[in-house]
């Protein structure tokens, strides 16, 4: 008789990461019977929620329920309907919200309770909305790229399957850059974290792991832009701010209520004499890097090496994967190659900054002109983070992996946080069974 | 050319009042500027007194000048410094300055010499 | 009001020499720092703003650069004509530390 396949054993999961600039929506699957292998989770779909961040919402929550039904009714028909109720739901803001709650927490809680409302609508089985820590953040992005790169797994393959495979189970480092914050996670090499705060234990697959991490609240690309500009217009005369992290005749004009609207600009914080002032871009990479790393203190260290701000930071170790915000910008000035030196990323940096306005906007007609004018700026700031913030140097550069996506999943720490939250990993390596399971009869 | 210049400067009786003007010529006080004063005692350093941000008529004072002086602007063209309670301390040169931080909007005039003595 | 040291307050350098004169800002200033030239009877004239940028019309020779709060000003090759006093001013802020100038470096030429 013929054999005939067996209906998919398999699960899903959704993950909602409400980031400080948008939403995302991913769906992820895995073999029922697999469950504690490693790297049989994958992404199946992701969806981008169209509009700005949940923390956007906060004077307007009744709108937050439609804001999320397009990605929600793009998973019901995703996910098979007979799996709907066993779908756990969740939902991680980030940087975006922790500002929020740091301005007001009844704001927070209030944009929460509406967004967990709308989640329960649906016929997945919802499992809450929360603000995750800046060190979950990293945690969890550390644990979706080593998952997604095969590290935890003890079997040592004689071939490749995903791109960066050092053939090796040394871990990655992860870094991630988002809107609002950005973190910095790795294994040391016999090095003590000298700050509690930043050091993470983890047994995986029977193996102990020391971690550090951070995460930098206000040093994502977009909270300091703000810091920036708060801190140069106090330096300007009037209110035309001469910008080099712009093109060339770029214009833009900026609210000063817009400018302090931000907790990452308080320490800025001054009265000006103008309601309303002129971005006019000079699109000079050298001075845009100077006034970049005006935002980093390091004048102040505590322990034996900081990065900045007074925040330990062991010596770099390994190889570093670059996801989110440092994949996105380098993809799109077209610099993720592997074969790329720092030295020519600033070259080419120097080069696109000094481009004319109108001249990028002919070269990239397609792009939103919001994002296309922050290029300059975000590819910079991207230098000096991890050049003067992190001390990776010309030679290290080439331990840096900018990184989309690895087999098909993106790089971030939503797969990280649904992989723990569903006790995916666990803690001892497990039994490996003598035959595998046949879908076939 | 671009030029200011400041009038009024002479004795004034202590505890008595005065009052400086700063005329422009080949611009106008348009709003993108900081009108400023700065005064410099005999054989002393530069002090700074105030700046009016012309755009808004915002002031800006000095912790020790507040109450005593007191920055207008009067026409399209002057700014004035008023001073009162006028004692030796005063004595300097007074300068008046147009505060635009690029190499091109920086302007002082020659000064004038404000001398408080019985 | 933000107070800004400046050090030291003479320095005698032959022709040819270099002088160098810091400023210390009791606050960040994040690079809001000019620096003047002043000769007798003349009032001060702009040679470096926003830390190290030189204004127009100013020899290469003077040099401005910055280390945390404190500030540099340093005339390389000394000429005759550099004898002047020189003020370090803040320039950032004004609302919040006001615009004070330091206390000046007179500047004597050999």
């Known amino acids: 008789t013929q054999n005939k396949a067996l209906p998919e054993n398999v699960k899903y999961g959704i993950v909602l990461d409400a980031g400080s600039s948008h939403t995302s929506l991913y769906i992820y699957k895995w073999p029922a019977e697999k469950e504690n292998d490693t790297g049989v989770v994958h992404q199946v779909e992701e969806c981008r929620v169209k509009g700005p961040g949940i923390s956007k919402f906060v004077q307007k929550v009744n709108e937050i329920g439609i804001y999320l039904t397009d990605c929600m009714e793009r998973a019901r028909e995703v996910i098979p309907r007979s799996q709907h109720q066993e779908t756990p739901v969740y939902l991680g803001a980030t940087a975006g919200m922790r500002l929020l709650r740091m301005e007001s927490e009844e704001l927070a809680d209030r944009v929460l309770d509406v967004v967990e409302r709308s989640l329960s609508n649906y016929p997945f089985d919802f499992q809450g909305a929360r603000i995750i820590t800046g060190q979950e953040e990293g945690a969890y992005g550390w644990i979706t790229i080593n998952y997604l790169l095969g590290k935890f797994s003890q079997k040592t393959r004689w071939f490749s399957i995903v791109p960066y495979e050092t053939n090796n189970q040394e871990t990655f480092g992860a870094l991630d850059l988002g809107g609002a914050s950005t973190q910095v996670t790795f294994v040391p090499q016999n090095q003590t974290i000298e700050s509690p705060d930043n050091a993470l234990q983890f047994r995986l697959y029977g193996k102990d792991y020391n971690v550090y991490t951070h995460s930098f609240l206000c040093y994502g690309k977009d909270q300091a832009l703000w810091q920036k500009l708060a801190k140069d217009i106090q330096v300007a005369s009037n209110e035309i701010l001469r910008d080099p992290c712009f093109h060339p005749g770029y214009k833009k004009v900026v609210n000063v209520s817009d400018l302090y609207k931000t907790p990452c600009t308080k320490r800025f914080e001054m009265t000006l004499p103008f309601q309303q002032f002129e971005i006019q871009g000079i699109g000079n990479y050298q001075q845009c890097h100077q006034s970049i790393l005006e935002l980093f203190n390091t004048s102040y260290c505590p322990y034996s090496q900081c990065a900045f701000n007074g925040i330990f930071l062991p010596p770099l170790q390994g190889d570093f994967g670059a996801f989110s915000a440092f994949y996105f910008v380098m993809k799109f000035l077209n610099l993720t190659s592997e074969k790329v030196s720092q030295e020519k990323v600033t070259e080419m940096m120097k080069k696109f900054c000094a481009q004319p306005w109108e001249e990028i906007k002919t070269s990239y007609a397609g792009v939103k002109e919001k994002y296309l004018s922050e290029y300059c700026f975000s590819g910079t700031y991207i230098l000096s983070l991890l050049l003067q913030g992190y001390h990776f140097t010309a030679d290290s550069w080439e331990h840096i992996h900018f990184i989309g996506k690895i087999q098909g999943s993106d790089a971030g720490w939503t797969l990280g946080y649904m992989l723990n939250l569903t006790n995916m990993i666990p803690a001892e390596q497990p039994l490996s069974t003598p035959l595998s399971h046949s879908t076939y009869v | 050319q671009e030029q200011l210049e400041e009038s009024g400067g002479g004795l004034v009786q202590p505890e008595g009042s005065l009052t400086l003007t700063c005329k422009a010529s080949?611009?106008?006080?348009?709003?993108?500027?900081?009108m400023c004063w700065v005064r410099q005692a005999p054989g002393k350093g530069l002090e700074w007194i105030g700046c009016i941000y012309i755009g808004s008529g915002t002031t800006y004072y000095a912790s020790w000048a507040k109450g005593r002086f007191t920055i207008s602007k009067t026409s399209s063209t002057a700014v004035t410094l008023q001073m009162t309670g006028l004692t030796a301390a005063d004595t300097a040169t007074y300068f008046c300055?147009?505060?635009?931080?690029?190499?091109?909007?920086?302007?002082w005039g020659p000064g004038t010499l404000v001398t408080v003595s019985s | 009001d933000i107070v800004m040291t400046q050090t030291p307050a003479s320095v005698s350098e032959p022709v040819g020499g270099t002088v160098t004169i810091k400023c210390q800002a009791s606050?960040?200033?994040?690079?809001?720092l000019a620096w003047y030239q002043q000769k007798p009877g003349q009032p001060p004239k702009l040679l470096i703003y926003k830390a190290s940028n030189l204004a127009s019309g100013v020899s290469s020779r003077f040099k401005g650069s910055r280390s945390g709060t404190e500030y540099t000003l340093t005339i390389s090759d000394l000429e005759c004509a550099d004898a002047a006093t020189y003020y370090c001013q803040n320039w950032y802020g004004i609302s919040t530390y006001g615009r004070a100038f330091g206390g000046g470096t007179e500047v004597v030429v050999k």
């Open positions: 300055a147009r505060d635009q931080y690029d190499d091109s909007g920086n302007l």
């Open positions: 606050q960040n200033i994040y690079s809001g």
């Open positions: 080949g611009f106008a006080l348009s709003s993108s500027y900081y």
